[in-house]
């Protein structure tokens, strides 16, 4: 069923783009017939096109009526600069180019799978790493912190580079870099734990280049619902890669009889994927799918980009909402398996764990659920948004808000159900995570709508930085700290071990509700910010003298 939905969504997206092309051809014909006096049909940001009447914009998810910016044919009217030479004037692209774009998106998604596979392979063999290097829990925390911090610091740098230099070269170099570092780290001797820490930091830098730049290439290859679909596929790579990482880690370790080999799988695949990116991913111009390929000559400074992003309310609120998602997923991913194990101890269906790993079975089940709900969430979110776009222009942030608020309810119910039924708790986790993950691709799409193409990599980077800083960089530790604080004020018993962690985890649904509020705030400004982005893109398409970004 899901596969059918995906197929129909893909087909629908392709049909929609074909229809767009046909509409553009008709408009050009009408304009030529009218002696060229009408406003030209160039597409704006995310595919904005102006009808002959001048009051309807073909946006990414439908059409918006607007007041004309000037009488038809007025010099400087947005969209008129590229009547003859712009992509809008070109003949329809051959089918092979569509296939090429599909292949490029597939390779980029595969790269994202490997990004997360690599990250979670280490998580899958973390206990073996701890055992081998004699790493204490604080040392394991250091490995995680160094990775996230280096990722956070590197993301804005790659955002800057991604908006200014050849993106596929940066992508490939990033993959080659983290592949080489991960492969090398499998040979680190027992006494050099600090080298392992350094290697995780370097991998964080390599992976930041990918996570920051790859979505912007997809944004430049597709528009409208096709872009939503492709971003959905790209972001589905997160749970898929994470799940495969755990599986790869444990299965390779068992097959080879040595955990070191687990760290040698993703680098080999990474090198292949990096090469494929160089070969198959076209060197798209920023704004290419938005029909602005050759026109985006204007370059703004990084400082101006940052100011523009901070003033972009839809971007700011959606970034804060993403941080809330990150906070919850980080905390739940770390603590839920142990919480469920403690629940079973209280229910007398499991023994108190004195020798870690505690809740290994629960970790496995939770990992499988996360993998599946990631897929289901992305598909559901994309499908719901696609349907809601027919009803409202604010569909994207509203679907996200509903998903978040619904998720908060089910996350709350986890703690109610866990007291009496582990199966009930797993059902709540399933529904809660599906709803929580439904906004992954949509959030990326929101960013594509409200941020101009030449700023997208910086925007993705800043959002990534924010979501890690306010989200999963601190949430696992905060939950552990609160749990310990509660436990210190109560008597030492399995019941209070369970309850204290449960009470601490109750912070998650509150943060998720806050995230839902941020998405509702995004909905308030979404239409105006999107229109502003389209207008700015049209201004960027004009001669430099008239550019005001």
């Amino acid at each position: 069923m899901m596969c059918l939905e995906c197929a129909s969504a893909a087909a629908g997206g392709a049909e929609e783009e074909e229809a767009d092309a046909e509409r553009r051809r008709r408009r050009r014909g009408a304009q030529r017939g009218a002696g060229g006096s009408g406003c030209c049909g160039a597409r704006g940001a995310g595919g904005a096109g102006v009808s002959a009447a001048g009051d309807e914009v073909q946006t990414l998810s439908g059409s918006v009526r607007r007041a004309p910016t000037g009488p038809p044919g007025t010099p400087g009217t947005p969209g008129c600069a590229a009547t003859a030479k712009g992509p809008g004037a070109q003949q329809p692209k051959p089918a092979s180019l569509g296939r090429g774009r599909g292949a490029a998106a597939a390779i980029l998604s595969l790269g994202n799978v490997l990004n997360y596979l690599d990250r979670y392979t280490v998580a899958g063999v973390l206990l073996d790493i701890q055992q081998h290097f004699g790493v204490k829990d604080r040392g394991a925390g250091l490995l995680q912190s160094v990775f996230i911090c280096s990722f956070m610091v590197a993301a804005p740098i790659f955002g800057y580079l991604g908006d200014r230099f050849n993106r596929k070269v940066i992508l490939s170099c990033g993959i080659f870099f983290w592949s080489a570092v991960t492969f090398s780290s499998s040979f680190i001797a027992q006494q050099y734990f600090w080298l392992l820490v350094l290697s995780r930091g370097l991998v964080g830098i390599g992976e930041a280049s990918y996570s920051t730049i790859a979505p912007t290439i997809i944004g430049d290859l597709f528009t409208k619902n096709t872009r939503t679909l492709m971003l959905s596929v790209f972001y589905f790579a997160i749970p898929l890669g994470s799940g495969l990482g755990y599986i790869t880690g444990s299965s390779v370790k068992q097959a080879a009889g040595d955990w070191h080999w687990a760290l040698r799988v993703s680098p080999v695949l990474g090198m292949i994927t990096g090469t494929l990116i160089l070969i198959l991913v076209p060197a798209t111009k920023r704004g290419h799918a938005d029909q602005l390929g050759d026109q985006l000559k204007a370059r703004t400074s990084w400082l101006r980009d940052m100011k523009a992003l901070i003033r972009n309310r839809s971007y700011v609120f959606s970034s804060l909402a993403t941080s809330a998602v990150s906070f919850a997923t980080g905390a739940l991913g770390m603590w839920i398996p142990l919480y469920l194990h403690r629940a079973q101890v209280v229910q007398k269906t499991a023994e108190t764990c004195n020798s870690p790993p505690c809740g290994a079975k629960d970790s496995l089940i939770f990992g499988a659920i996360t993998c599946f709900t990631g897929f289901l969430g992305v598909v559901t979110g994309a499908g719901a948004t696609r349907w809601c776009r027919l009803k409202t222009q604010r569909a994207d942030p509203l679907v996200c808000a509903v998903g978040m608020l619904g998720s908060a309810i089910f996350i709350c119910l986890i703690f109610v159900a866990a007291k009496s039924s582990i199966v009930g708790a797993y059902i709540c986790i399933f529904v809660g995570e599906t709803l929580l993950f439904s906004n992954w691709a949509i959030t990326a799409d929101i960013l594509m709508y409200v941020v101009i193409p030449t700023r997208r990599a910086t925007a993705v980077a800043l959002q990534s930085f924010t979501s890690h800083l306010l989200g999963d960089a601190g949430s696992p530790y905060l939950i552990g700290f609160i749990s310990d604080l509660i436990r210190q004020s109560t008597k030492d018993s399995p019941l209070w071990e369970f309850l204290s962690l449960g009470y601490a985890l109750m912070l998650c649904p509150f943060v998720v509700v806050l995230g839902g509020m941020f998405f509702l705030a995004t909905a308030l400004f979404f239409v105006s910010d999107r229109a502003r982005a389209e207008q700015q893109v049209n201004q960027l398409a004009m001669p430099p003298a008239s550019v005001k970004v």
Partner: antibody, heavy 125, light 107 residues
């Protein structure tokens, strides 16, 4: 100065129990991994058990030959490590050394940088 | 379990000579090998860690080398206090294991 002093050894009958104690001083005990190593008369060294610090959930590891019979534990407030030996056998006769693992805050070495003077345990009927 | 084999079991030398003691692992263990000296009626003491890293307070005549499966403890110009039993220990994986020892005696 690092000091490790073992007590609690003696002569016991097969099948009986004995608890060894190791008092420590001169270092931050709560952050340090501790082990017991034994040496049968005229034989080589054999690692018995390891207990990690509280930052590693006080995880314990045992040699296969004593698993299920011996239990290692620690009391951070007293800076002591213990070895509870149950169902003792003749082949458990040995000098038992309390050992310290070198600590590096984030991680620990599995080798033994300090050894106690040892305590003799004799299992005989 | 990783098995360590030490050779020779006994080595007879005269003071002032230089000697090499061998330790072989049943599988590759990188540099996770450590050397201990146990004098008669004394507790063991750590000489070398991680195959070649020296220990504070240990005379510089003791040195270690090797990687993978073959390791060497070298004593440059043996002194009278060096006549004792030498053990290698692996920490590559649990359980921690020791070699059977090499006894260094006066020729």
């Amino acid at each position: 100065e690092v000091q490790l002093v073992e007590t609690g050894g003696g002569l016991v009958r097969p099948g009986s129990s004995l608890k060894l104690s190791c008092a420590t001083s001169g270092f931050t005990f709560s952050d340090t991994w501790m082990s017991w190593v034994r040496q049968a008369p005229g034989k080589g060294l054999e690692w018995v058990a390891l207990i990690k610090d509280k930052n590693s959930n006080s995880e314990a590891n045992y040699a296969e030959s004593i698993k299920g019979r011996f239990t290692i534990s620690r009391d951070d407030s007293k800076s002591r490590v213990y070895l509870q030996m149950n169902t003792l056998r003749d082949q458990d006769t040995a000098t038992y050394y309390c050992t310290r693992h070198e600590d590096f805050y984030y991680y620990s070495g599995y080798y033994f940088d300090y050894w106690g003077q040892g305590v003799m345990v004799t299992v005989s009927s | 379990d990783i098995v360590l084999t030490q050779s020779p079991p006994t080595l007879s030398v005269t003071p002032g000579e230089s000697v090499s003691l061998s330790c072989r692992a049943s599988q590759g263990i990188s540099t996770s090998i450590h050397w201990y000296q146990q004098r008669s009626n004394e507790s063991p003491r750590l000489l070398i860690k991680y195959a070649s890293q020296s220990i504070a307070g240990i005379p510089s005549r003791f040195s270690g080398s090797g990687s993978g499966t073959d390791f060497i403890l070298s004593i440059n110009r043996v002194e009278s206090e060096d006549f004792s039993v030498y053990y290698c220990q692996q920490t590559y994986s649990l359980p921690l294991t020791f070699g059977p020892g090499t006894k260094l005696e006066v020729k």
